[in-house]
């Protein structure tokens, strides 16, 4: 009997973000997935790790502020991580902060993975082009 | 054909930390890599997935703190995480944070993992200290 | 010789809490371990990588809060986050602030893994009933 | 090849400022840390502070706070540093180095910028 | 902060001998040791990290030891060129730290 199939993707964000669907650099590290459209499609039906880092940089004014980081498969919702930040209503210099949002799934062939966030302009692409990164293994494949 | 090969580490941080460079405890569960001098030294080419947890103790002043916790791979700056905390500029109680980090990387034989906080006095290494981690997995080997 | 054996298990935190020990949803994924009475008892050896992710909710009165997540291995407090949150004093909306923490760890069988929530009250199972997750997989078996 | 190349030498007025600049080529700029090291005249080496290029968070000596303080331009590839409320014991060689191992071991050192203070 | 005594002042030595630069520090540092050569006019340049570990276009007549709180940088035979100050810094303990140095002469 052979070894595990081994699948895996390691992303970082685009530089200029416009959605809050977000849409990921192509010349990540990628094996045994296809990346296309802001989506991982899976090629090996399994059991998928799947974890997600964002840095966020906030500017507060005078109210607090909600980031989210969802993951998403097959476009529905499945996990997300909800941070307020400014809380103190105090207007002040730049707030820096880090979601982050895993998921253990299984997916089929052809089942997609996405990420959404609601204010999207506040993802660092600029300080932090590295840090906003999206990686999904396999870790027990069904066949 | 044999299945994957198997190397892992988790390391807790020192009680008495005195560097920006990390420095972790030898007597952690370390297989198939090496420690030193707050490094991690890989002997098995391969995909590495790398994780580690730090927990921050501040007392805040009249200004906000940044936390910062960095991946270093071969000494070069490879992921991190900035969290602003004592935002709200009130002299107030101790105020505790967790940052974390994770890497999904290919190393090759030699290669080092490190980790750099620029705070690291505020490294909460006494109410904590089990919960200061380095640990790091070979997910797929490439021999 | 055969690949690896395979356990796992993600499950989402039951609807109503009533207790520091979190309980669980018994039908979320699950193989080769099994939930019972809010812990997981593992049916293998070998090392686990465990990982609990919790969505909280605060109404922030004059005073901060910490909330706090504790995994437990067989009742023992293996590994904790402490943040603090409402830092300000301001009496303000909803704070939402969203904590993980992992581990590595060689468990025999019957071992048991549970989670513990000081002010269990704040686990946000409302606004988020599928956003807090208690997730294990076996890295390396030893048979 | 890796450069640091540093602007020229400054002659400053005590309780003067002055800001010296120091561009990095030949490596990715956010990669490491940019370094700042003071020689005063027939004297040994004094580490000042560092500074992550990514984000601009600046460590210091001790001994340098309130003295020193770090910028850097990503776009430019270029780090600085300004000296503040200058005296005569400023008056020093300055280097930026850029480290081997992340850390301290510095492979790679500008060429140096002499600062003299005097009236 | 760590201290760092090199020793001596002045090394004075003919060419083609070998010659050996101490510095020991106030506390144990392992093996977080550097070393550097600054000739004059020049800035220092990298020669040894880690007490012993070498670095690519070093010539390989350079060579450290020691660990703990005891170190050597010894050069297995001298040559005009490598007449310049040696200083050895460690990085063990925040902030980095550097000795006073050694002067080397030819005689």
């Known amino acids: 009997s052979t070894p595990s199939k081994k699948s895996w993707a390691y992303l970082q964000v685009s530089k200029h973000l416009n959605n809050t669907k977000l849409s990921w650099n192509e010349d990540g590290t990628i094996h045994g997935l296809i990346y296309q459209d802001g989506n991982l499609i899976v090629q090996f039906p399994g059991l998928y790790f799947i974890v997600c880092q964002l840095q966020f940089l906030v500017q507060c004014s005078n109210h607090s502020v909600d980031l989210t980081l969802q993951l998403l498969i097959n476009s529905k919702i499945k996990k997300q991580t909800l941070v307020t930040v400014c809380e103190s209503g105090v207007q002040s210099k730049n707030i820096y902060q880090n979601l982050s949002q895993f998921l253990l799934h299984y997916l089929q062939v052809n089942s997609t993975i996405s990420v959404r966030v609601d204010n999207f302009q506040y993802v660092d692409t600029n300080t932090f082009p590295l840090d906003n990164v999206l990686s999904v293994f396999l870790y027990s494949s069904s066949d | 054909s044999t299945p994957s090969k198997k190397s892992w580490a988790y390391l807790q941080v020192s009680k008495h930390l005195n560097n920006t460079k990390l420095s972790w405890n030898e007597d952690g569960t370390i297989h198939g890599l090496i420690y030193q001098d707050g490094n991690l030294i890989v002997q098995f080419p391969g995909l590495y997935f790398i994780v580690c947890q730090l927990q921050f103790l501040v007392q805040c002043s009249n200004h906000s703190v940044d936390l910062t916790l960095q991946l270093l791979i071969n000494s070069k700056i490879k992921k991190q995480t900035l969290v602003t905390v004592c935002e709200s500029g009130v002299q107030s109680k101790n105020i505790y944070q967790n940052l974390s980090q994770f890497l999904l990387h290919y190393l090759q034989v030699n290669s080092t993992i490190s980790v750099r906080v620029d705070n690291f006095q505020y490294v909460d290494t006494n109410t904590f200290p089990l919960d200061n981690v380095l640990s790091v997995f070979l997910y797929s080997s490439s021999d | 010789s055969t690949p690896s054996k395979k356990s796992w298990a993600y499950l989402q935190v039951s609807k109503h809490l009533n207790n520091t020990k979190l309980s669980w949803n018994e039908d979320g994924t699950i193989h080769g371990l099994i939930y019972q009475d809010g812990n997981l008892i593992v049916q293998f050896p070998g090392l686990y990588f465990i990982v609990c992710q919790l969505q909280f909710l605060v109404q922030c009165s004059n005073h901060s809060v910490d909330l706090t997540l504790q995994l437990l291995i067989n009742s023992k407090i293996k590994k904790q986050t402490l943040v603090t949150v409402c830092e300000s004093g301001v009496q303000s909306k909803n704070i939402y602030q969203n904590l993980s923490q992992f581990l590595l760890h060689y468990l025999q069988v019957n071992s048991t893994i549970s989670v513990r929530v000081d002010n269990f009250q704040y686990v946000d199972t409302n606004t988020f009933p599928l956003d807090n997750v208690l997730s294990v997989f076996l890295y390396s078996s030893s048979d | 090849e890796v450069q640091l190349q540093q602007s020229g030498p400054e002659l400053v007025k005590p309780g003067a400022s002055v800001k010296i600049s120091c561009k990095a080529s030949g490596y990715t700029f956010t990669d490491y840390y940019m370094n700042w090291v003071k020689q005063s005249h027939g004297k040994t080496l004094e580490w000042i502070g560092d500074i992550n290029p990514n984000h601009g968070g600046a460590t210091y000596n001790q001994k340098f706070k309130g003295k020193a303080t770090l910028t850097v331009d990503k776009s430019s590839s270029t780090a600085y540093m300004e000296l503040r409320s200058l005296t005569s014991e400023d008056s020093a060689v300055y280097y930026c180095a850029s480290p081997y191992d992340g850390y301290y071991g510095f492979a790679y050192w500008g060429q140096g910028t002499l600062v003299t203070v005097s009236a | 902060d760590i201290l760092l005594t090199q020793s001596p002042a002045i090394l004075s030595v003919s060419p083609g001998e070998r010659v050996s630069f101490s510095c020991r520090a106030s506390?144990?540092?392992?093996?977080?040791i550097h070393w550097y050569q600054q000739r004059t006019n020049g800035s220092p340049r990298l020669l040894i990290k880690?007490?012993?570990e070498s670095i690519s276009g070093i010539p390989s007549r350079f060579s450290g030891s020691g660990s703990g709180t005891d170190f050597t940088l010894s050069i297995n035979s001298v040559e005009s060129e490598d007449i310049a100050d040696y200083y050895c810094q460690q990085s063990n303990s925040w902030p980095t730290t550097f000795g006073g140095g050694t002067k080397l002469e030819i005689k």
């Open positions: 506390q144990s540092i392992g093996t977080s």
């Open positions: 880690y007490g012993s």
